[in-house]
Interface confidence: medium
């Protein structure tokens, strides 16, 4: 999906009002220095591409993020403020339903959400410092 047509200010508002808090809740009890940020983005569409990938694509050791509150709110924000996004996500939704039904917070998931926090911070204020 091409994120260049999204309403970035509206997505930023959604992040500041709710998504950021849900990410903090998920990470509660984890030290902010525990994980190194290895994923970066250079502008807002690039950030959203990385955010979508980390949030909705199951990875080894962490298959359950899509059902988390921050993920559902992220999906809603993208669906509302990125024209045509919902239509591109039909296959992804089917894959999500096949994913594990139980929520399991693994260390790998915590690391992934830590990366997401960094990406969202960059989206909120694009740092443009790394390619």
């Amino acid at each position: 999906y091409d994120f260049t047509n999204c309403d970035f200010e509206k997505i930023k508002a959604a992040y500041l009002s709710t998504i950021s808090k849900d990410l903090i809740t998920y990470m509660s009890g984890t030290k902010s220095t525990e994980f190194n940020n290895t994923v970066s983005c250079s502008n807002r569409p690039h950030c959203l591409t990385e955010i979508q990938s980390l949030t909705f694509n199951p990875t080894a050791g962490c298959a359950s993020l899509a059902k988390e509150m921050f993920a559902m709110k992220t999906k809603a924000a993208l669906a509302i403020w990125c024209p045509g996004y919902s239509e591109t996500q039909i296959n992804a939704t089917q894959a999500m339903k096949k994913a594990r039904k139980s929520k399991v917070t693994t260390n790998k998931c915590l690391e992934q959400v830590s990366q997401l926090q960094g990406l969202w911070r960059r989206f909120n204020r694009p740092l443009l410092k790394q390619q």
Partner: antibody, heavy 117, light 107 residues
């Protein structure tokens, strides 16, 4: 209305330094990055580096690291770019330009720096 | 660093002509490319960003497109005020680089 107003033309001798200013108005100064672009006479555009006005963090390309110092004064919404140890090849028009996503929606009018003995 | 190869370096055209300028990136920069117009003695002016989004106030005769690492700026019907130099610039990440420029002259 967003405006970036740069200081006037400068003529300097080799070895001297020059400080170019770029005063921003019409937007929140600390929200956007300030980049500097060089254009030598009859040449194309060359990206020099950038500064984050919110924390003064700078990124310069290698060839300008020993030549350029970028600073900001948040109280006056002004960005500065200082060129040291001037040589003839530093003769150029220097532009400031603001950005959020890497493209430049507003530019200063340019400052001509001439290095001549 | 990402290299931007712009062509042609110059072209001659008449008012009303359709003009196409291309820019090729040395690696994938997705849609992160901008186009600028510069007139002598003036600062560059943003025309297109994210490869195909027209900047505010830019006439609709300008358009941008992308195919892989090849980017195109098209002026559908050249106007007298369009004679200028055009630059592409990737905005994928540091360091930003510009194409060498295309000078559009009157035939």
């Amino acid at each position: 209305e967003v405006q970036l107003v740069q200081s006037g033309a400068e003529v300097k001798k080799p070895g001297a330094s020059v400080k170019v200013s770029c005063k921003a108005s019409g937007y929140t100064f600390t929200t956007y990055w300030m980049h500097w672009v060089k254009q030598a006479p009859g040449q194309g555009l060359e990206w020099m580096g950038m500064i984050d006005p919110s924390d003064s963090e700078t990124t310069l390309i290698q060839k300008f690291k020993d030549k350029v110092t970028m600073t900001v004064d948040k109280s006056t919404s002004t960005a500065y770019m200082e060129l040291s140890s001037l040589r003839s090849e530093d003769t150029a028009v220097y532009y400031c330009a603001r950005t959020l996503d890497g493209y430049y929606d507003y530019w200063g009018q340019g400052t001509t720096v001439t290095v001549s003995s | 660093d990402i290299q931007m190869t712009q062509s042609p370096s110059s072209l001659s055209a008449s008012v009303g002509d359709r003009v196409t300028i291309t820019c090729r990136a040395s690696e994938n920069i997705y849609s992160y490319l901008a186009w600028y117009q510069q007139k002598p003695g003036k600062a560059p002016k943003l025309l297109v960003y994210f490869a195909k989004t027209l900047a505010e106030g830019v006439p609709s005769r300008f358009s941008g497109s992308v195919s892989g690492t090849d980017f195109t700026l098209t002026i559908s019907s050249l106007q007298p005020e369009d004679f200028a130099t055009y630059y592409c610039q990737h905005h994928y990440g540091t360091p930003w680089t510009f194409g060498g420029g295309t000078k559009v002259e009157i035939k």
